[in-house]
Protein backbone atom coordinates (compact mmCIF):
# COMPACT_ATOMS: atom_id res chain seq x y z
CA UNK A 1 0.00 0.00 0.00
CA UNK A 2 1.43 3.43 -1.22
CA UNK A 3 2.45 5.31 2.31
CA UNK A 4 -0.61 7.66 3.12
CA UNK A 5 -2.98 5.48 1.77
CA UNK A 6 -5.37 3.48 3.92
CA UNK A 7 -5.76 -0.10 2.76
CA UNK A 8 -8.91 -0.57 2.96
CA UNK A 9 -9.72 2.00 0.58
CA UNK A 10 -7.01 0.15 -1.88
CA UNK A 11 -9.28 -3.05 -1.74
CA UNK A 12 -12.19 -1.46 -1.56
CA UNK A 13 -13.01 -2.24 -5.51
CA UNK A 14 -12.13 -6.08 -4.88
CA UNK A 15 -14.75 -5.93 -1.99
CA UNK A 16 -18.50 -7.46 -2.19
CA UNK A 17 -20.85 -4.44 -1.70
CA UNK A 18 -22.86 -4.53 1.74
CA UNK A 19 -26.37 -6.00 1.63
CA UNK A 20 -29.20 -4.45 2.89
CA UNK A 21 -29.38 -6.34 6.22
CA UNK A 22 -25.70 -5.66 6.55
CA UNK A 23 -25.57 -1.90 6.09
CA UNK A 24 -28.62 -2.13 8.67
CA UNK A 25 -26.41 -4.60 11.37
CA UNK A 26 -23.53 -1.94 10.71
CA UNK A 27 -25.57 1.20 11.35
CA UNK A 28 -26.75 0.41 14.46
CA UNK A 29 -23.38 -0.89 16.17
CA UNK A 30 -22.29 2.60 14.86
CA UNK A 31 -24.93 4.18 16.47
CA UNK A 32 -24.69 2.19 19.59
CA UNK A 33 -20.62 3.33 19.32
CA UNK A 34 -21.76 6.86 19.51
CA UNK A 35 -24.04 6.69 22.48
CA UNK A 36 -21.42 5.02 24.40
CA UNK A 37 -19.22 8.16 23.55
CA UNK A 38 -21.96 10.64 24.80
CA UNK A 39 -22.57 8.82 28.05
CA UNK A 40 -19.28 8.78 28.97
CA UNK A 41 -19.23 12.72 29.19
CA UNK A 42 -22.91 12.17 31.08
CA UNK A 43 -21.01 9.96 33.56
CA UNK A 44 -18.40 11.99 33.50
CA UNK A 45 -20.12 15.27 34.17
CA UNK A 46 -22.64 13.87 36.68
CA UNK A 47 -22.99 10.90 38.92
CA UNK A 48 -26.54 9.91 37.52
CA UNK A 49 -24.75 6.61 35.95
CA UNK A 50 -25.02 4.96 39.28
CA UNK A 51 -28.17 6.79 40.50
CA UNK A 52 -31.02 4.44 42.09
CA UNK A 53 -33.40 6.83 41.90
CA UNK A 54 -34.19 5.57 37.87
CA UNK A 55 -37.31 4.24 38.44
CA UNK A 56 -38.56 7.75 39.73
CA UNK A 57 -37.93 9.50 36.72
CA UNK A 58 -38.68 6.60 34.61
CA UNK A 59 -41.96 7.29 35.31
CA UNK A 60 -42.46 10.39 33.82
CA UNK A 61 -40.67 9.16 30.17
CA UNK A 62 -43.09 7.34 27.47
CA UNK A 63 -40.17 5.53 26.35
CA UNK A 64 -39.90 3.16 23.51
CA UNK A 65 -39.53 -0.94 24.73
CA UNK A 66 -39.48 -4.16 23.45
CA UNK A 67 -42.09 -6.18 24.75
CA UNK A 68 -43.31 -10.04 24.27
CA UNK A 69 -46.36 -8.64 22.01
CA UNK A 70 -43.79 -7.18 19.33
CA UNK A 71 -42.95 -10.17 18.07
CA UNK A 72 -38.96 -9.86 18.52
CA UNK A 73 -38.09 -12.13 20.73
CA UNK A 74 -37.84 -15.63 19.66
CA UNK A 75 -40.89 -16.94 21.72
CA UNK A 76 -43.60 -15.42 19.25
CA UNK A 77 -41.21 -13.74 16.84
CA UNK A 78 -42.89 -12.08 13.67
CA UNK A 79 -40.41 -10.54 11.49
CA UNK A 80 -43.51 -8.06 10.29
CA UNK A 81 -44.58 -7.28 13.41
CA UNK A 82 -41.47 -6.61 14.98
CA UNK A 83 -40.34 -4.74 11.78
CA UNK A 84 -43.00 -2.43 12.33
CA UNK A 85 -41.99 -2.36 15.81
CA UNK A 86 -38.33 -1.56 15.42
CA UNK A 87 -39.53 1.49 12.98
CA UNK A 88 -42.05 2.57 14.84
CA UNK A 89 -39.78 2.68 18.25
CA UNK A 90 -37.10 4.43 16.72
CA UNK A 91 -39.32 7.38 14.73
CA UNK A 92 -40.63 7.54 18.82
CA UNK A 93 -37.25 8.32 20.09
CA UNK A 94 -36.35 10.99 17.30
CA UNK A 95 -37.83 13.72 19.51
CA UNK A 96 -35.67 12.45 22.71
CA UNK A 97 -32.72 12.82 20.18
CA UNK A 98 -33.37 16.22 19.45
CA UNK A 99 -33.73 16.88 23.33
CA UNK A 100 -30.30 15.43 23.20
CA UNK A 101 -28.35 18.23 21.04
CA UNK A 102 -28.13 20.92 23.55
CA UNK A 103 -27.23 18.68 25.81
CA UNK A 104 -23.38 17.99 25.66
CA UNK A 105 -20.40 20.22 25.79
CA UNK A 106 -17.61 18.24 24.27
CA UNK A 107 -19.75 15.69 22.68
CA UNK A 108 -22.11 18.25 20.38
CA UNK A 109 -20.89 16.57 16.45
CA UNK A 110 -21.45 12.92 18.55
CA UNK A 111 -24.59 13.68 19.64
CA UNK A 112 -25.53 15.08 16.28
CA UNK A 113 -23.85 12.03 14.22
CA UNK A 114 -26.10 9.60 16.67
CA UNK A 115 -29.57 11.72 15.97
CA UNK A 116 -28.52 11.99 11.86
CA UNK A 117 -27.61 8.28 11.92
CA UNK A 118 -30.47 7.27 13.29
CA UNK A 119 -32.53 8.89 10.22
CA UNK A 120 -30.63 6.95 7.83
CA UNK A 121 -31.10 3.74 9.82
CA UNK A 122 -35.15 4.74 9.65
CA UNK A 123 -34.60 4.78 5.89
CA UNK A 124 -32.64 1.60 5.71
CA UNK A 125 -35.74 -0.12 7.88
CA UNK A 126 -38.64 1.53 5.84
CA UNK A 127 -37.10 0.10 2.63
CA UNK A 128 -37.03 -3.97 4.12
CA UNK A 129 -40.18 -3.12 5.71
CA UNK A 130 -43.60 -4.59 3.65
CA UNK A 131 -46.25 -3.24 5.50
CA UNK A 132 -45.37 0.95 5.59
CA UNK A 133 -49.41 1.48 6.61
CA UNK A 134 -48.72 -0.16 9.95
CA UNK A 135 -46.45 2.38 11.37
CA UNK A 136 -47.97 5.05 12.89
CA UNK A 137 -45.53 8.28 13.04
CA UNK A 138 -45.65 10.42 15.83
CA UNK A 139 -47.64 13.74 16.33
CA UNK A 140 -45.71 16.74 15.56
CA UNK A 141 -47.40 18.80 18.19
CA UNK A 142 -47.65 16.20 20.67
CA UNK A 143 -43.44 15.73 20.51
CA UNK A 144 -43.32 19.44 20.24
CA UNK A 145 -45.11 19.76 23.78
CA UNK A 146 -43.02 17.00 24.89
CA UNK A 147 -39.60 18.69 23.71
CA UNK A 148 -40.55 21.92 26.08
CA UNK A 149 -41.84 19.83 28.86
CA UNK A 150 -38.56 18.18 29.01
CA UNK A 151 -36.37 21.25 28.55
CA UNK A 152 -38.17 23.41 30.94
CA UNK A 153 -37.12 20.30 33.80
CA UNK A 154 -34.55 21.59 36.65
CA UNK A 155 -31.43 20.48 36.29
CA UNK A 156 -31.17 17.60 38.09
CA UNK A 157 -33.94 15.86 36.00
CA UNK A 158 -32.18 17.00 32.82
CA UNK A 159 -29.68 15.06 33.85
CA UNK A 160 -30.88 12.11 34.69
CA UNK A 161 -33.52 12.59 31.65
CA UNK A 162 -30.36 12.69 29.27
CA UNK A 163 -29.17 9.50 31.37
CA UNK A 164 -32.38 7.41 30.71
CA UNK A 165 -32.44 8.45 27.30
CA UNK A 166 -29.60 7.07 25.97
CA UNK A 167 -29.66 3.62 28.30
CA UNK A 168 -33.25 3.30 26.90
CA UNK A 169 -32.01 3.91 23.49
CA UNK A 170 -29.24 1.91 23.82
CA UNK A 171 -31.54 -1.31 25.02
CA UNK A 172 -33.86 -0.98 22.39
CA UNK A 173 -30.84 -0.92 19.29
CA UNK A 174 -29.50 -3.65 21.32
CA UNK A 175 -32.73 -6.05 20.86
CA UNK A 176 -33.46 -4.30 17.57
CA UNK A 177 -30.28 -6.11 16.63
CA UNK A 178 -30.68 -9.26 17.99
CA UNK A 179 -33.92 -8.98 16.67
CA UNK A 180 -32.44 -8.26 12.86
CA UNK A 181 -30.43 -10.93 12.80
CA UNK A 182 -32.89 -13.81 13.11
CA UNK A 183 -34.56 -11.83 9.84
CA UNK B 1 -3.08 -11.31 30.83
CA UNK B 2 -5.73 -10.26 32.28
CA UNK B 3 -6.32 -11.79 35.96
CA UNK B 4 -8.77 -11.06 38.54
CA UNK B 5 -9.06 -11.80 42.17
CA UNK B 6 -12.11 -11.78 45.03
CA UNK B 7 -11.54 -10.48 48.22
CA UNK B 8 -14.47 -10.04 51.26
CA UNK B 9 -14.70 -11.85 54.42
CA UNK B 10 -15.26 -15.36 54.22
CA UNK B 11 -18.13 -15.51 56.98
CA UNK B 12 -21.40 -13.81 56.94
CA UNK B 13 -24.11 -13.55 59.25
CA UNK B 14 -27.80 -14.49 58.04
CA UNK B 15 -29.80 -11.21 57.44
CA UNK B 16 -26.48 -9.33 56.94
CA UNK B 17 -24.80 -8.06 53.67
CA UNK B 18 -22.51 -9.77 51.50
CA UNK B 19 -19.78 -7.96 49.91
CA UNK B 20 -17.16 -8.85 47.26
CA UNK B 21 -14.84 -7.16 44.93
CA UNK B 22 -13.06 -8.19 42.19
CA UNK B 23 -9.62 -6.18 41.31
CA UNK B 24 -8.60 -6.98 37.73
CA UNK B 25 -5.18 -6.44 36.44
CA UNK B 26 -3.53 -6.73 33.28
CA UNK B 27 -6.68 -4.47 31.56
CA UNK B 28 -8.39 -1.69 32.35
CA UNK B 29 -12.17 -2.27 32.85
CA UNK B 30 -12.87 1.04 31.33
CA UNK B 31 -11.26 0.13 28.13
CA UNK B 32 -12.86 -2.08 25.22
CA UNK B 33 -16.24 -3.11 25.24
CA UNK B 34 -15.75 -5.94 28.18
CA UNK B 35 -18.93 -6.51 30.39
CA UNK B 36 -18.15 -8.03 34.24
CA UNK B 37 -19.47 -10.61 35.76
CA UNK B 38 -20.53 -12.62 39.21
CA UNK B 39 -21.42 -16.22 39.33
CA UNK B 40 -21.75 -18.50 42.30
CA UNK B 41 -21.46 -22.35 43.16
CA UNK B 42 -22.76 -23.61 46.35
CA UNK B 43 -20.98 -26.01 47.78
CA UNK B 44 -21.02 -29.46 45.21
CA UNK B 45 -23.72 -27.90 42.54
CA UNK B 46 -23.82 -26.28 39.86
CA UNK B 47 -22.94 -22.43 38.84
CA UNK B 48 -25.19 -19.94 39.00
CA UNK B 49 -24.58 -16.60 37.15
CA UNK B 50 -26.03 -13.15 39.60
CA UNK B 51 -24.90 -10.26 37.05
CA UNK B 52 -23.66 -8.56 35.29
CA UNK B 53 -21.64 -4.26 34.75
CA UNK B 54 -21.21 -3.43 31.03
CA UNK B 55 -19.08 -1.29 29.68
CA UNK B 56 -21.36 1.93 30.46
CA UNK B 57 -22.11 0.81 33.45
CA UNK B 58 -25.08 -0.78 33.29
CA UNK B 59 -26.24 -3.65 35.50
CA UNK B 60 -28.10 -6.48 34.85
CA UNK B 61 -29.48 -8.65 37.67
CA UNK B 62 -30.37 -12.53 37.71
CA UNK B 63 -34.36 -12.05 38.19
CA UNK B 64 -35.03 -13.96 41.59
CA UNK B 65 -31.93 -12.23 42.63
CA UNK B 66 -32.37 -8.47 41.60
CA UNK B 67 -34.30 -7.34 45.04
CA UNK B 68 -31.16 -8.28 46.79
CA UNK B 69 -28.15 -7.80 44.70
CA UNK B 70 -25.82 -4.71 43.18
CA UNK B 71 -23.17 -4.55 41.17
CA UNK B 72 -21.16 -1.58 40.98
CA UNK B 73 -17.32 -0.32 39.72
CA UNK B 74 -14.76 2.14 40.31
CA UNK B 75 -12.56 2.34 37.26
CA UNK B 76 -10.33 4.65 39.41
CA UNK B 77 -9.30 1.55 41.17
CA UNK B 78 -9.88 -1.17 38.67
CA UNK B 79 -12.47 -3.07 40.40
CA UNK B 80 -16.55 -3.82 40.87
CA UNK B 81 -17.62 -4.89 43.53
CA UNK B 82 -21.15 -7.41 44.22
CA UNK B 83 -23.50 -6.81 47.34
CA UNK B 84 -26.15 -9.43 48.32
CA UNK B 85 -28.39 -7.82 50.60
CA UNK B 86 -30.34 -10.47 53.55
CA UNK B 87 -28.24 -13.40 53.18
CA UNK B 88 -29.00 -17.37 54.31
CA UNK B 89 -27.42 -20.14 54.72
CA UNK B 90 -28.40 -20.88 50.87
CA UNK B 91 -26.00 -18.01 50.25
CA UNK B 92 -23.07 -20.07 50.90
CA UNK B 93 -21.14 -20.63 48.07
CA UNK B 94 -17.81 -20.60 46.08
CA UNK B 95 -18.28 -16.36 44.33
CA UNK B 96 -16.68 -16.08 40.90
CA UNK B 97 -15.60 -12.37 39.50
CA UNK B 98 -15.27 -12.91 35.47
CA UNK B 99 -15.38 -11.17 32.39
CA UNK B 100 -17.54 -11.51 29.71
CA UNK B 101 -18.21 -9.61 26.34
CA UNK B 102 -16.57 -11.76 23.39
CA UNK B 103 -17.44 -10.85 19.65
CA UNK B 104 -20.75 -8.53 18.87
CA UNK B 105 -21.69 -8.70 23.02
CA UNK B 106 -21.69 -5.19 23.35
CA UNK B 107 -23.91 -4.88 20.30
CA UNK B 108 -25.82 -7.33 21.41
CA UNK B 109 -26.38 -7.05 25.31
CA UNK B 110 -25.38 -11.18 25.29
CA UNK B 111 -22.71 -11.70 28.16
CA UNK B 112 -23.17 -15.17 27.68
CA UNK B 113 -19.54 -16.46 27.61
CA UNK B 114 -17.11 -15.51 30.17
CA UNK B 115 -13.13 -16.08 29.34
CA UNK B 116 -11.41 -14.80 32.48
CA UNK B 117 -12.45 -16.07 35.75
CA UNK B 118 -11.15 -15.12 39.03
CA UNK B 119 -9.62 -18.09 41.39
CA UNK B 120 -12.77 -17.86 43.66
CA UNK B 121 -14.02 -17.03 47.10
CA UNK B 122 -15.42 -19.54 49.37
CA UNK B 123 -18.16 -17.20 51.58
CA UNK B 124 -20.18 -19.13 54.41
CA UNK B 125 -23.33 -17.70 55.87
CA UNK B 126 -23.98 -18.95 59.47
CA UNK B 127 -24.02 -17.15 62.64
CA UNK C 1 -32.82 -25.21 39.68
CA UNK C 2 -30.60 -24.90 36.43
CA UNK C 3 -33.07 -23.48 33.78
CA UNK C 4 -30.74 -25.52 30.97
CA UNK C 5 -31.08 -29.05 31.26
CA UNK C 6 -28.35 -31.22 30.95
CA UNK C 7 -27.40 -34.89 31.78
CA UNK C 8 -26.42 -35.09 35.12
CA UNK C 9 -23.02 -37.73 34.57
CA UNK C 10 -22.16 -39.05 31.36
CA UNK C 11 -19.28 -41.81 30.77
CA UNK C 12 -17.24 -42.16 27.80
CA UNK C 13 -14.48 -44.12 26.49
CA UNK C 14 -10.66 -43.32 25.70
CA UNK C 15 -10.36 -42.43 22.05
CA UNK C 16 -14.06 -42.62 21.58
CA UNK C 17 -16.58 -39.53 20.75
CA UNK C 18 -19.23 -38.38 23.41
CA UNK C 19 -22.05 -36.16 23.23
CA UNK C 20 -23.38 -33.56 25.88
CA UNK C 21 -26.71 -32.03 25.12
CA UNK C 22 -27.92 -28.63 26.83
CA UNK C 23 -31.88 -28.60 26.28
CA UNK C 24 -33.47 -24.94 26.85
CA UNK C 25 -36.22 -23.40 25.22
CA UNK C 26 -37.00 -20.55 22.72
CA UNK C 27 -36.11 -17.80 25.08
CA UNK C 28 -32.55 -19.11 25.29
CA UNK C 29 -30.87 -21.67 23.52
CA UNK C 30 -33.24 -20.67 20.42
CA UNK C 31 -32.96 -16.94 20.77
CA UNK C 32 -29.93 -16.90 18.69
CA UNK C 33 -26.06 -18.13 18.53
CA UNK C 34 -25.36 -17.16 22.49
CA UNK C 35 -24.46 -20.64 23.70
CA UNK C 36 -21.50 -21.11 25.39
CA UNK C 37 -19.38 -24.07 27.01
CA UNK C 38 -17.66 -24.73 30.13
CA UNK C 39 -15.03 -27.49 31.62
CA UNK C 40 -14.34 -27.56 35.46
CA UNK C 41 -11.68 -29.95 36.24
CA UNK C 42 -12.31 -30.89 40.19
CA UNK C 43 -11.34 -28.08 42.61
CA UNK C 44 -10.21 -25.59 39.83
CA UNK C 45 -12.28 -22.35 38.25
CA UNK C 46 -14.14 -23.15 34.85
CA UNK C 47 -12.62 -22.91 31.83
CA UNK C 48 -14.33 -21.30 28.34
CA UNK C 49 -14.14 -23.77 25.75
CA UNK C 50 -16.86 -22.84 23.03
CA UNK C 51 -19.12 -19.37 22.92
CA UNK C 52 -21.40 -18.09 19.92
CA UNK C 53 -22.27 -21.71 19.54
CA UNK C 54 -19.46 -23.28 17.44
CA UNK C 55 -16.33 -20.77 18.30
CA UNK C 56 -13.57 -22.56 19.67
CA UNK C 57 -11.91 -20.41 22.25
CA UNK C 58 -8.04 -20.02 21.73
CA UNK C 59 -5.99 -22.77 22.86
CA UNK C 60 -8.87 -25.11 22.81
CA UNK C 61 -8.14 -28.50 21.08
CA UNK C 62 -10.36 -29.26 18.04
CA UNK C 63 -11.48 -32.20 19.60
CA UNK C 64 -14.05 -30.31 21.25
CA UNK C 65 -16.33 -28.60 19.31
CA UNK C 66 -20.37 -27.20 19.61
CA UNK C 67 -23.44 -27.32 17.63
CA UNK C 68 -27.29 -26.37 18.10
CA UNK C 69 -30.44 -27.38 16.44
CA UNK C 70 -33.51 -25.55 17.51
CA UNK C 71 -33.85 -24.92 21.53
CA UNK C 72 -30.80 -27.83 21.91
CA UNK C 73 -27.31 -27.18 22.07
CA UNK C 74 -24.59 -29.93 21.91
CA UNK C 75 -20.76 -30.37 22.98
CA UNK C 76 -19.18 -33.32 21.03
CA UNK C 77 -15.88 -34.40 22.11
CA UNK C 78 -13.55 -36.58 20.15
CA UNK C 79 -11.04 -38.94 21.00
CA UNK C 80 -11.38 -39.03 24.45
CA UNK C 81 -8.85 -38.23 27.00
CA UNK C 82 -8.18 -39.16 30.87
CA UNK C 83 -7.92 -35.25 31.03
CA UNK C 84 -11.41 -34.45 29.72
CA UNK C 85 -13.03 -35.93 33.08
CA UNK C 86 -14.45 -33.24 34.13
CA UNK C 87 -17.77 -31.36 34.67
CA UNK C 88 -18.98 -29.53 31.89
CA UNK C 89 -21.63 -26.20 31.72
CA UNK C 90 -23.56 -24.70 29.01
CA UNK C 91 -24.57 -21.21 29.24
CA UNK C 92 -26.84 -18.94 27.14
CA UNK C 93 -27.71 -15.62 26.78
CA UNK C 94 -31.85 -15.62 27.79
CA UNK C 95 -34.61 -12.51 26.87
CA UNK C 96 -33.84 -9.95 28.23
CA UNK C 97 -30.78 -9.04 29.67
CA UNK C 98 -30.17 -12.58 31.37
CA UNK C 99 -27.48 -15.03 31.53
CA UNK C 100 -28.57 -19.00 32.66
CA UNK C 101 -26.56 -22.19 33.51
CA UNK C 102 -27.14 -25.60 32.54
CA UNK C 103 -26.91 -27.74 35.72
CA UNK C 104 -23.64 -29.55 34.63
CA UNK C 105 -22.36 -32.89 33.49
CA UNK C 106 -20.08 -34.77 35.01
CA UNK C 107 -18.26 -37.03 32.54
CA UNK C 108 -16.08 -40.08 33.38
CA UNK C 109 -13.70 -41.17 31.00
CA UNK C 110 -13.37 -45.23 31.05
CA UNK C 111 -10.04 -47.02 30.16
Known amino acids: VPPGEDSKDVAAPHRQPLTSSERIDKQIRYILDGISALRKETCNKSNMCESSKEALAENNLNLPKMAEKDGCFQSGFNEETCLVKIITGLLEFEVYLEYLQNRFESSEEQARAVQMSTKVLIQFLQKKAKNLDAITTPDPTTNASLLTKLQAQNQWLQDMTTHLILRSFKEFLQSSLRALRQM | EVQLQESGPGLVKPSQTLSLTCTVSGGSIATSYYAWSWIRQPPGKGLEWMGV???????YYKPSLKSRTSISRDTSKNQFSLQLSSVTPEDTAVYYC???????????????????WGKGTLVTVSS | QAVLTQPPSMSGTLGKTLTISCNGT?????????VSWYQQLPGTTPKLLIE???TRVSGIPDRFSGSKSDNTASLTISGLQSEDEATYYCASYRETNNVVFGGGTHLTVLG
Open chain 3, 52 to 54: GVT
Open chain 2, 98 to 116: ARAGLGDSYYLGTYYAMDY
Open chain 2, 53 to 59: IDYDGDT
Open chain 3, 26 to 34: SSDIGSGNY
